[in-house]
């Protein structure tokens, strides 16, 4: 059975069939003998019951209020009654737009990775029995598909794919064809997936200095915008006054990924800075890549292969 | 009348995953999208994705993408949201909250009560 | 991704002022007569709750002193008088495109 109308506030298309179902039903079919009551009240008007004769257009059924269609008139708030239960709703009715085969107002936009499980399921459960056929379409062009009971897309995502997808279901009521319609707006975008982030360039740097002198240390790396990036050296960090991090820069890529880039700045290098590890780690929820500098004095760089420095 | 319930207060170290889950009573469990949104302590509402009941369909707020899993169980209509490699600054009070599935109807009118989770070694 | 900006971070007022709480979008919101943008009231160890829907639809049960208004990138949440229940953080949230964003919320604090 399909479950009640809980949301307070709807918006529906003129000329649409519609229905409220309140959330007691189950209770009311309990108490089959309490009385059960329908009421409209919009702008300056108090609320009227409803019942069959205020409308050609209204049914009533147990737990549900129909309309066949649902009409711009129809805006106002309804509210059911039963014994010391009420529920309220405010209807919108808004206006059908006539130059396209779905109101925009009607939309529910989905994002799709390429290359992921993507599916349209073109089903209405309530009006089920009534409806006759149903046909897909995207940007109002119908799609010619098999099955014209219940049409569905089932397929891996490719940018091609992008679009507005309409279901529109065809039911006969009292010898009169209605039409419901409900679209998704598509969007295909990139994989959004994490990557594992990677510290660009060589694992250990020899960097060659003068005792006196100042020298920047730049790390960077390529990661999520989550992942952390930070420098470790010495017994604990801070504890030399002449050694700063600088402010993290980040960059988006095309990707939606980031470039980020840290420098360490020695100041005034002195003799304990020398052939120590300068450890720049990027932590991400898969791990952590770690790079390493050692500072050695320009007089001693004949004793290290010319291969493993960085200026 | 429409009540989201969520399971209680977990306490996880640091890597670890939690599981929170969101039960819904007495409303169109499928007709609705479902959505998950935290608050570190003395922070702002940070919205973490979203699920539709009807098809499992998901979308990740991108920092969560790959470490935030949500999940439905039409049959107890009941919604999962699972993080995973935990660190201190997941401490938050996670809230399950419904919506309409049309855009414009995508605003939050029934919240659960919330659930703290403590990330600590 | 659409970014959203609140001011004042913080609003000093006393009961019975008017407060006007301003939510910035990084780009429209509003599409075919309609604006995406909704407000939230949140008090300490509280959900939030919703106050306005589209911009300026009162939600049921909120009091009329609360109105919202705006369209396209900035939209404005009133408080005609102020009542003593009505300090709290206010949050704005758009529904115009995936991700969802709230704004990084205005508390409201008696002067």
């Known amino acids: 059975a399909e479950s009640c109308t809980s949301r307070p506030h709807i918006t529906v298309v003129e000329g649409e069939p519609f229905y409220l179902k309140h959330c007691s039903c189950s209770l009311a079919h309990e108490i089959e003998t309490t009385t059960k009551s329908w009421y409209k009240s919009s702008g300056s008007q108090e609320h009227v019951e409803l019942n069959p004769r205020s409308s050609s257009r209204i049914a009533l059924h147990d737990c549900v209020l129909e309309f066949w269609p649902v009409e711009l008139n129809d805006t106002g708030s309804y509210f059911f009654q039963m014994k010391n239960y009420t529920q309220k709703w405010k209807l919108n009715v808004i206006r059908r737009n006539k130059h396209s085969c779905f109101t925009e107002r009607q939309v529910t936009s989905k994002i799709v990775e390429v290359k992921k499980f993507f599916q349209i399921t073109c089903e209405n459960s309530y009006y089920q029995t009534l409806v006759n056929s149903t046909s897909l379409y995207k940007n109002c062009k119908k799609l010619l598909l098999e099955n014209n009971k219940n049409p569905t897309i089932k397929k891996n995502a490719e940018f091609e794919d992008q679009g507005y997808y309409s279901c529109v279901h065809f039911l006969h009521h009292n010898g009169k064809l209605f039409n419901i319609t409900k679209t998704f707006n598509i969007t295909i975008v990139e994989d959004r997936s994490n990557i594992v982030p990677v510290l660009l360039g060589p694992k250990l740097n020899h960097v060659a200095v003068e005792l006196g002198k100042n020298v920047r240390l730049n790390c960077s790396a390529l990661l999520n915008e989550e992942d952390v990036i930070y420098w470790m050296f010495g017994e604990e960090n801070g504890s030399d006054p002449n050694i700063h991090e600088e402010k993290e820069m980040r960059i988006m890529t095309p990707e939606g990924k980031w470039h980020a880039s840290k420098v360490l700045r020695i100041e005034n290098i002195g003799e304990s800075n020398l052939n120590v590890l300068y450890n720049c780690t990027v932590a991400s929820t898969g791990g952590t890549d770690t790079k390493s500098f050692i500072l050695v004095r320009k007089a001693d760089m004949a004793d290290i292969p010319g291969h493993v420095f960085t200026r | 009348q429409v009540q989201l319930v969520q399971s209680g207060a977990e306490v996880k170290k640091p890597g670890a995953s939690v599981k929170v889950s969101c039960k819904a009573s007495?409303?169109?469990?499928?007709?609705?999208?479902m959505h998950w949104v935290r608050q570190a302590p003395g922070q702002g509402l940070e919205w973490m994705g979203t699920?539709?009941?009807?098809?499992?369909?998901?979308y990740y707020n991108q920092k969560f993408q790959g470490r935030a899993t949500m999940t439905v169980d039409t049959s107890t209509s009941t919604v999962y949201m699972e993080l995973s490699s935990l660190r201190s600054e997941d401490t938050a009070v996670y809230y399950c909250?419904?919506?309409?599935?049309?855009?414009?109807?995508?605003?939050?009118?029934?919240w659960g009560q919330g659930t703290t989770v403590t990330v600590s070694s | 991704e659409i970014v959203l900006t609140q001011s004042p971070g913080t609003l000093s007022l006393s009961p019975g002022e008017r407060a006007t709480l301003s939510c910035r979008a990084s780009?429209?919101?509003?599409?075919?007569?309609?604006?995406?943008m909704h407000w939230y009231q949140q008090k300490p160890g509280q959900a939030p709750r919703l106050l306005i829907y589209?911009?300026?639809n009162l939600e049921t049960g909120i009091p009329d002193r609360f109105s919202g208004s705006g369209s396209g990138t900035d939209f404005t949440l009133t408080i005609s008088r102020l009542e003593p229940e009505d300090f709290a953080v206010y949050y704005c949230q758009q529904s115009r495109e995936l991700p969802l964003s709230f704004g990084q919320g205005t508390k409201l604090e008696i002067k």
């Open positions: 780009k429209s919101v509003s599409t075919s007569g309609d604006s995406y």
């Open positions: 699920i539709d009941p009807s098809d499992s369909y998901t």
């Open positions: 909250t419904t919506s309409g599935d049309y855009d414009a109807d995508r605003y939050f009118d029934v």
């Open positions: 007495d409303y169109t469990f499928t007709s609705n999208w």
């Open positions: 589209l911009a300026s």
